[in-house]
Interface confidence: medium
């Protein structure tokens, strides 16, 4: 997260760290007791590594009573996700067992009504991604409030040049932005999950390259079919 600040500890009980061989790889969001939603591209190069999900964490390294690392039973990428596009960049991870819920671990309701979030709406994005252009990784969860950007502006030739379909949304990126390592994490508007940080290699913090988020409402049928 660029231009953000340390989050209040455990105030986002839905927040997950998707880990590869014990190291943070991507963000994720607990959407059901046994399921975490993330970005498909996150596991593109996971190869033969061990993928796990950390829940109930604020610090990645320090012991915390609520922290628990879960093995992943099953990884389900969206059927149309492909390494060379930002479209359909969603992944559902089934935990090896139901998460132990509590004040620091709780699923987040996700948007089912397929309507665009109003431009200018302030939404919260959180993650353990890099906090500066030098690539410094934080130990504790960071967050930032970002205004939603209208699709027409985001699709300008100087911005994302028509790449933002109706299944994607944008948020402003003027010095405050999601960045590498935040992919798969939640964009939360009014206490509801609206978007998932896409995992392209986009430049961060440049106002002409807004943050791109996958609209979960557009994938309600797929999410329901996997969770069923």
């Amino acid at each position: 997260i660029l231009g953000g600040r340390e989050a209040e500890a455990h105030a986002r009980p839905y927040m997950a760290s998707v880990q590869l061989n014990g190291a943070h790889l991507c963000g994720g969001v607990l959407v059901a007791e046994q399921w975490v939603l993330s970005a498909a591209h996150c596991l593109e190069d996971a190869a033969d590594g061990k993928v796990q999900v950390l829940l109930g964490a604020h610090s990645l390294s320090q012991p915390e009573p609520s922290k628990r690392l879960y093995d992943v039973l099953r990884a389900v990428p969206h059927p149309d996700s492909q390494p060379d596009t930002i479209d359909h960049d969603l992944l559902l991870l089934q935990l090896s067992e139901k998460a132990t819920l509590g004040p620091a671990v709780r699923p987040l309701p996700w948007q089912r009504v397929d309507r665009d979030v109003a431009p200018g709406t302030l939404c919260d994005v959180a993650g353990w991604g890099i906090v500066n252009h030098a690539g410094r990784r934080p130990d504790s969860l960071q967050h930032v409030l970002l205004p939603v950007l209208d699709r027409a502006t985001c699709n300008r030739r100087t911005h994302h040049d028509g790449a933002i379909t109706e299944r994607l949304m944008c948020a402003e990126s003027n010095r405050r932005d999601s960045c590498k390592g935040d992919s798969g994490g939640p964009l939360v508007c009014g206490g509801v999950l609206e978007g998932v940080v896409t995992s392209g290699s986009r430049v961060c913090g440049n106002r002409k390259k807004p943050g791109i988020y996958t609209r979960v409402a557009s994938y309600a049928a797929w999410i329901d079919s996997v969770l069923a």
Epitope: N21, L43, E44, D45, A46, A47, D48, G49, K50, V51, L73, R74, A75, V76, P77, P79, Q94
Partner: antibody, heavy 120, light 112 residues
Framework: AVQLVESGGGLVQPKGSLKLSCAAS????????MNWVRQAPGKGLEWVAR??????????YYADSVKDRFTLSRDDSESMLYLQMNNLKTEDTAMYYC???????????WGTGTTVTVSS | DVLMTQTPLSLPVSLGDQASISCRSS???????????LEWYLQKSGQSPKLLIY???NRFSGVPDRFRGSGSGTDFTLKISRVEAEDLGVYYC?????????FGSGTKLEIK
Amino acid sequence: AVQLVESGGGLVQPKGSLKLSCAASGFSFNTYAMNWVRQAPGKGLEWVARIRSKSNNYATYYADSVKDRFTLSRDDSESMLYLQMNNLKTEDTAMYYCVRQGFYWYFDVWGTGTTVTVSS
Amino acid sequence: DVLMTQTPLSLPVSLGDQASISCRSSQTIVHSNGNTYLEWYLQKSGQSPKLLIYNVSNRFSGVPDRFRGSGSGTDFTLKISRVEAEDLGVYYCFQGSHVPYTFGSGTKLEIK
């Protein structure tokens, strides 16, 4: 570019031995499971063997037809995969492909193959 | 061992036609982790095979959306909505859920 190059094939007599090599480049070899797949002349594909990464204890798996005769190994420091083939039979005659296995267990990168001919 | 039975062995088509290839496994190929490791590969003459579909229905990078995989349990299908000249070759289904892994016998897609 991601590449797999097989070598070591050739003509060998029945009951003889041969060691195939596969040189990997363009990716983090040590993190991937690797496989050998073969194809007899004019026939279909047959999976031969699989070796997992260090994080999975280099676990190996073999097709029943080669078990106890073929040994799969890897050298992560050199990005090399090996298949030691002993007690070769005429039915082992085939093109042998070195294949990378992605996270979702699919075979996403194939070498061009090396030909093994077992004949007296 | 899991036997993968592919039909038909040969599929003559006209360019622009839809093609459908069936693959049936002798037992369920749902892995203990819940995934179904069913893939489809295309091997063109004189070339190494190439991955088309994984996890039953996921198209691999660069694979056109005219290729669609479907199925569950023991019955799987690959459909090509409008066959193009570059689609000709031998198609193999493959199961990676149970060791030993097994390929189908192949289906040759050729021009009528």
